[in-house]
Interface confidence: medium
């Protein structure tokens, strides 16, 4: 097949300073090159030949896989969430063997009220979801369950769900101790032993945008970044316009290589640029110098 | 004592919105969830939107999913019901009610005397 | 979806104890509420919790729950409980359902 090559009349000279100028072909005409043989040999960087086009793997892209993109998408999850393993004791519910089994209508029952229970216990946390019952053991009952917390992914999830976690801790410890049996009986929906009171375990999710970003700039991580907009992570180059860490290449186009963000200076009818950001201008002298 | 007083009923055509306020008081307003619940003319009652103390959660019956934006002013002591794309079958009282607890899981101690909204041509 | 049956009427003596009964799926694994409805009035709680009466509730009002059905049950009933009754049940899995309502008529 053949393959028809743009031309392009403007010449880009790197801030190194070495011309990467383009031929200087009649624009009216045509340039076509052969492709011949091995179609995959034109697709670089791990690219495959579809039969169409170069399919590129992430952060190529191009006709031949050649460039490297200024942007590679991250996702992280709607939510995050975080578990913790709790034990309590209640006093106000005798313990049968019923209870073991959790298709019986006294587990039932009992599961119920204690759900409840929480429900009320952690009003007021935003990102209580529910409890969920692991385990009924002799004690009067000693009741082995996780409370699970969800919140909308965000930067600070973490300091949000630590925060959720601490909250927790402190209702539970906080009706554990008022909610006791006085003289044999339970004025509220459930009584408790204040001694109890047990945190085993807390299992937050793990999600960091940075690690996706190094993981999927490949070897160029070092000079991707990450960075917040409307508190979604971007994973950047320098070369991709609009945030902090954006080159600036005023006269010039940003070009990714495995040195880094580098400005490809543009020479117009003029003047040429240079400069590591393409913001020194010389004028081009109005006289032919024949050689 | 607790009141609950309902506001922004009437009369509007297929496809226009509403606006439904509930002014509450008489309690904490920050410390319960709050319900729109609704009734047809002569039908049953049909929950339709709730809302936690600090609005960190919202759910949504299915029917009004989409269309409907419960919200809330905790500096006005107030509940919203914004009705968008109406139908006629969203015809009804609309009554807002207290849930006990911050979180909306719970049962509804007090109502409000209702708003009708009439959804015609 | 979760669905909450009540017979549309019940019909009682006065004095005598009217029973009135919510079916759902399991709903026994959930928390009833039942609610009070007077011609043109909003609704009332009366009993929350399967069993518990809020504070002004007469004692003449109890309730229970267990397997499929809930059960309101007024005894003594007076031609003042004549109304609507509505059972509602919530839990994460069905959000707030309500029953459709029992008329409770109370005969002269």
């Known amino acids: 097949p053949l393959a028809t090559i743009p031309v392009s009349t403007t010449s880009l000279t790197s801030s190194e300073g070495s011309t990467i100028s383009t031929p200087s072909v009649d624009i009216s005409t045509p340039v076509t090159t052969s492709i011949v043989g091995d179609q995959c040999s034109r697709c670089k960087n791990g690219g495959f030949w579809d039969g169409l086009k170069c399919q590129c793997l992430t952060p190529y892209y191009g006709e031949s896989c050649e460039e490297v993109v200024n942007s590679i998408d991250i996702a992280p999850p709607e939510t995050v969430s975080a578990q913790m393993e709790l034990t309590v004791t209640v006093t106000s519910v005798k313990f049968t063997d019923e209870l073991k089994n959790h298709s019986s209508q006294e587990f039932r029952e009992f599961n119920k009220t204690f759900t409840e229970q929480m429900n009320i216990v952690y009003s007021g946390i935003p990102e209580y979801v529910g409890v969920n019952i692991t385990n009924l053991r002799l004690g009067s009952v000693v009741v082995e369950h996780d409370v699970l917390l969800r919140t909308k992914y965000t930067p600070e999830y973490k300091t949000a769900l630590d925060n959720a976690t601490e909250v927790v801790k402190q209702k539970i410890t906080k009706v554990t101790t008022e909610q006791i049996m006085t003289n044999d009986n339970c004025s509220a929906l459930m009584c408790f032993n204040t001694t109890g009171t047990q945190v085993q375990n807390i299992t937050v999710t793990q999600y960091d945008p940075v690690e996706e970003c190094r993981q999927k700039a490949e070897e160029y991580e070092d000079y991707f970044l990450v960075e917040y907009r409307d508190q979604k992570p971007y994973c950047i180059s320098p070369c991709e316009s609009g945030f902090n860490a954006s080159k600036n290449c005023n006269h010039g186009k940003c070009q990714m290589s495995q040195n880094g963000a580098r400005c490809l200076c543009v020479t117009t009818e003029t003047h040429w640029y240079s400069g590591e950001d393409c913001n020194q201008g010389t004028q081009k002298s109005h006289h032919h110098h024949h050689h | 004592q607790v009141q609950l007083v309902e506001s922004g009923g009437g009369v509007v055509q297929p496809g226009r919105s509403l606006r439904l306020s509930c002014a509450a008081s008489?309690?904490?307003?920050?410390?319960?969830?709050m319900h729109w619940v609704r009734q047809a003319p002569g039908k049953c009652l049909e929950w339709v939107a709730g809302?936690?103390?600090?609005?960190?959660?919202?759910y949504y019956a299915e029917a009004v999913k989409g269309r409907f934006t419960i919200s809330r002013d905790t500096s006005k002591n107030t509940l919203y019901l914004q009705m968008n794309s109406l139908r006629a079958e969203d015809t009804a009282v609309y009554y807002c009610?207290?849930?006990?607890?911050?979180?909306?899981?719970?049962?509804?101690?007090?109502w409000g005397q209702g708003t009708l909204v009439t959804v015609s041509s | 979806s979760y669905e909450l049956t009540q017979s549309p009427s019940v019909s009682v003596s006065p004095g005598q104890t009217a029973s009135i009964t919510c079916s759902g799926d399991?709903?026994?694994?959930?928390?009833t509420s039942w609610y009070q409805q007077k011609p043109g009035q909003s609704p009332v709680l009366v009993i929350y919790?399967?069993?518990k009466r809020p504070s002004g509730i007469p004692e003449r009002f109890s309730g229970s729950n267990s397997g499929n059905t809930a059960t309101l049950t007024i005894s003594g009933t007076q031609a003042m409980d004549e109304a609507d009754y509505y059972c509602?049940?919530?839990?994460?899995?069905?959000?707030?359902?309500f029953g459709c309502g029992t008329k409770l008529t109370v005969l002269r």
């Open positions: 008489g309690f904490t307003f920050s410390n319960h969830g």
């Open positions: 009610a207290r849930a006990t607890y911050t979180t909306g899981w719970s049962y509804f101690d007090y």
């Open positions: 509602q049940a919530y839990d994460r899995s069905t959000a707030w359902v």
């Open positions: 919790h399967d069993r």
């Open positions: 399991k709903l026994g694994d959930k928390y």
């Open positions: 809302i936690w103390s600090d609005a960190s959660n919202k």
